[in-house]
Interface confidence: low
């Protein structure tokens, strides 16, 4: 069965620096999300090999991509104490299969000691199918990620 | 709905440990959000303690120094407070409260536990 | 850490008066205030979030601006039941900080 591999786990980072998400996944998928989980699910970004990516507009100029669908590292700059949250890559397949996701922790420089990120991933690697489509954030964030490409319409 | 609820000693002595537990009904706290406890000094002044995510990790106001530590027993669903070498100036009311992570404001109070440190 | 102030320390009204609170932060904090209500031997209660989201089952007198530094909460016909203390809440850098509160009281 298609499995998505994710890492880290969970990571600490000050305010203005970057962090890395990896998604590996074996192959033979559509494409790749990268969600934010909360009440409100965002999507972060949608990549597609050989295709523009599209980025949330909060993310708009942060976001930097290495790497091909099968295995992306999506690099987030210039973090932001908002930005704290579980993110996590939904490979799209035959059936959408989900990474265990990766807690972020933005902390402030001078306090990142009293951050800690706990051994155990965030998630169960089951995850629960967010809502379909591009869920919207809360308004204070941003508006909801626009579809992909019509080439790339989700089933 | 979720509600939480603390508990603890209403009196502690100076230089002892202060222990508090919030039970949470209505919600499991391995699932999501960010779980807080805050305090209310008489005079009403609030100060946030710090919280522990849904997945265990912790983040403290830097205040409290290395006197802090917040834990959880996931099988009861309860997050704890415990506070180290307490004086008369950690005598106040204990909240505990639910936040989103990464938005941070506190949607879900408890009611209040009243702490008097004392000899 | 930032500082925030509220003013005026007590506002005295009557009811059906429009009141508005402030709450000034010490740095610009783009929209990250939140409001709080918190009656008397009462746990604290969000009004209003994101300097001004509403919040599911509050009243919609209540209603909230601002932004960077300088931030208002309104209630535009005061109720008896509306008597309480109020205090921000800056959620933008660590650690979480609230402002000292205004004590709203009928004249």
């Known amino acids: 069965a298609q499995e998505v591999q994710q890492s880290p786990h969970c990571t600490t980072v000050p305010v203005g620096a970057s962090v890395n998400i990896t998604c590996s996944t074996s192959g033979g998928l559509r494409g790749i999300y990268l969600r934010q989980l909360g009440p409100q699910p965002q999507d972060i970004i949608y990549y597609e090999d050989g295709v523009v990516p599209t980025t949330d507009r909060r993310f708009r100029g942060r976001i930097d991509f290495s790497g091909s669908q099968d295995n992306l590292t999506i690099t987030m700059h210039r973090l932001q104490l908002s930005d704290t949250g579980t993110y996590t890559c939904q490979a799209i397949t035959e059936v959408n299969v989900y990474g265990s996701g990766t807690l972020v922790l933005v902390t402030e420089e001078q306090s990142q000691g009293w951050h800690r990120c706990s051994d155990a991933p965030p998630r169960a690697s089951a995850l629960p199918a967010p809502p379909t489509g591009s869920a919207l954030p809360d308004p204070q964030t941003a508006s909801a990620l626009p579809d992909p490409p019509a080439a790339s319409a989700l089933p | 709905d979720v509600q939480l609820q603390e508990s603890g000693p209403g009196l502690v002595k100076p230089s002892q440990s202060l222990s508090l537990t919030c039970t949470v009904t209505?919600?499991?706290?391995?699932?999501?959000?960010?779980w807080n406890w805050i305090r209310q000094f008489p005079g009403n002044k609030l100060e946030w303690l710090g919280y522990?995510?849904?997945?265990?990790?912790?983040s403290y106001n830097p205040s409290l120094k290395s006197r802090i530590s917040i834990t959880r027993d996931t099988s009861k669903n309860q997050f704890f407070l415990q506070l180290n070498s307490v004086t008369t100036e950690d005598t106040a009311t204990y909240y505990c409260?639910?936040?989103?992570?990464?938005?941070?404001?506190?949607?879900?109070w408890g009611q209040g536990t009243s702490v008097t440190v004392s000899s | 850490d930032i500082l925030l102030t509220q003013s005026p320390a007590i506002l005295s009204v009557s009811p059906g008066e429009r009141v508005s609170f402030s709450c000034r932060a010490s740095q610009s904090i783009g929209t990250s205030i939140h409001w709080y209500q918190q009656r008397t031997n009462d746990s604290p209660r969000l009004l209003i979030k994101?300097?001004?989201e509403s919040i599911s089952g509050i009243p919609s007198r209540f209603s909230g601006s601002g932004s960077g530094t300088d931030f208002t909460l309104n209630i535009n016909s005061v109720e008896s039941e509306d008597i309480a203390d109020y205090y921000c809440?800056?959620?933008?850098?660590?650690?979480?900080?609230f402002g000292p509160g205004t004590k709203l009281e009928l004249k």
């Open positions: 994101y300097a001004s």
């Open positions: 209505g919600y499991s706290i391995t699932s999501d959000y960010a």
């Open positions: 409260a639910k936040s989103q992570l990464g938005r941070w404001a506190m949607d879900y």
């Open positions: 809440q800056q959620s933008i850098s660590w650690p979480l900080t």
């Open positions: 522990i995510s849904y997945s265990g990790s912790t």
